[in-house]
């Protein structure tokens, strides 16, 4: 079965710093979303080989990519306190598959000692349930993102 390996499980960074999240799969996917979990999950990026990536406007000018959709590293720059949260990779395959999640803790520089990551991965219960449908979603319409490629700061 298709799996998404995601790292790191957790990272603590000061305001203004950058963080790398890596999503790796065994291939055979259409594309990959990075989704911020929460009461209203939000798609942060959509990446597909050969397609101009899409980035949510909140991250305008703050995202970089390296690698390919099978082994993608996403860099988020100039982190803000409001960026704190759990980010999960979602591979678009015949059945959507989720990574284990990365908890990003953005802290004020002075209070870094107060917030530390444990070694345990984010709790699985925090992840959304996989979709029931098996049809390939169309990333042009299915995402919370407006149609992929449509602005930001880098197509």
């Amino acid at each position: 079965a298709q799996e998404v390996q995601q790292s790191p499980h957790c990272t603590t960074v000061p305001v203004g710093a950058s963080v790398n999240i890596t999503c790796s799969t065994s291939g055979g996917l259409r594309g990959i979303y990075l989704r911020q979990l929460g009461p209203q999950p939000q798609d942060i990026i959509y990446y597909e080989d050969g397609v101009v990536p899409t980035t949510d406007r909140r991250f305008r000018g703050r995202i970089d990519f390296s690698g390919s959709q099978d082994n993608l590293t996403i860099t988020m720059h100039r982190l803000q306190l409001s960026d704190t949260g759990t980010y999960t990779c979602q591979a678009i395959t015949e059945v959507n598959v989720y990574g284990s999640g990365t908890l990003v803790l953005v802290t004020e520089e002075q209070s870094q000692g107060w917030h530390r990551c444990s070694d345990a991965p984010p709790r699985a219960s925090a992840l959304p349930a996989p979709p029931t449908g098996s049809a390939l979603p169309d990333p042009q319409t299915a995402s919370a993102l407006p149609d992929p490629p449509a602005a930001s700061a880098l197509p």
Epitope: V52, R57, G61, I63, A151, S152
Partner: antibody, heavy 125, light 107 residues
């Protein structure tokens, strides 16, 4: 007012090198992607390369891949295009262009708006 | 590579006439199509983005429509300053590509 001023064009022999610069003003340069687009004399527009706001991610058109390098110095508010192994078919006016400034949109690369006035590169022996 | 085909290559018209320019795309680009205007000796200027949105400062006589693979730019009534070359561009896939352009000239 946003301003983009290209420089560095000129006459160069086939196989030679040239570095184009694009000095930006009137906006927060470090927050926007930038691109190079060229236009051969009497011809249409051809996208050459784009670079993310941080400079860490770059994209190239196949005809220039491996020969051209896009880069930026955000502290100097300047975009560069290093052109090596130049060929006659690289002869063109080279424009730098800023990512469109619309917060209502999302995406990693937006439309080209505005453009600089262009600088002419002529590759000939 | 996505190929954009503009037609006609040249249009000879008079001020006040209505203009419809076509841009046909080799595969779907959703709504990720823009139109630029270029006058002789000048840099291109963004007119329409995401198929139908007018860029800042662009007069209402310019409008865009279409979806998928067929797009049009309409100028409701040609003004003397509208005589120029018009290019469409997609940014759905790499590489970013432009159409060959349509020249709108004075009859």
């Amino acid at each position: 007012e946003v301003q983009l001023v290209e420089s560095g064009g000129g006459l160069v022999q086939p196989g030679g090198s040239l570095r184009l610069s694009c000095a930006a003003s009137g906006f927060t340069f470090s927050r926007y992607a930038m691109s190079w687009v060229r236009q051969a004399p009497g011809k249409g527009l051809e996208w050459v390369s784009s670079i993310s706001a941080s400079g860490a991610t770059t994209f190239y058109a196949d005809p220039v891949k491996g020969r051209f390098t896009i880069s930026r110095d955000n502290s100097k508010k300047t975009l560069y295009l290093q052109m090596n192994s130049l060929r006659a078919e690289d002869t063109a006016v080279y424009y730098c262009a800023k990512d469109q400034d619309f917060d209502i949109l999302t995406g990693y690369l937006n439309w080209f708006d505005p453009w600089g006035q262009g600088t002419l590169v002529t590759v000939s022996s | 590579e996505i190929v954009l085909t503009q037609s006609p290559a040249t249009l000879s018209l008079s001020p006040g006439e209505r203009v419809i320019l076509s841009c046909r795309v080799s595969q779907s680009v959703s709504s990720y199509l823009a139109w630029y205007q270029q006058k002789p000796g000048q840099a291109p200027r963004l007119l329409i983005y995401d198929t139908s949105n007018r860029a800042t400062g662009i007069p209402a006589r310019f409008s865009g429509s279409g979806s998928g693979t067929d797009f049009t730019l309409t100028i409701s009534s040609l003004e003397p300053e509208d005589f120029a070359v018009y290019y469409c561009q997609q940014r759905r896939n790499w590489p970013l590509t432009f159409g060959g352009g349509t020249k709108v000239e004075i009859k």
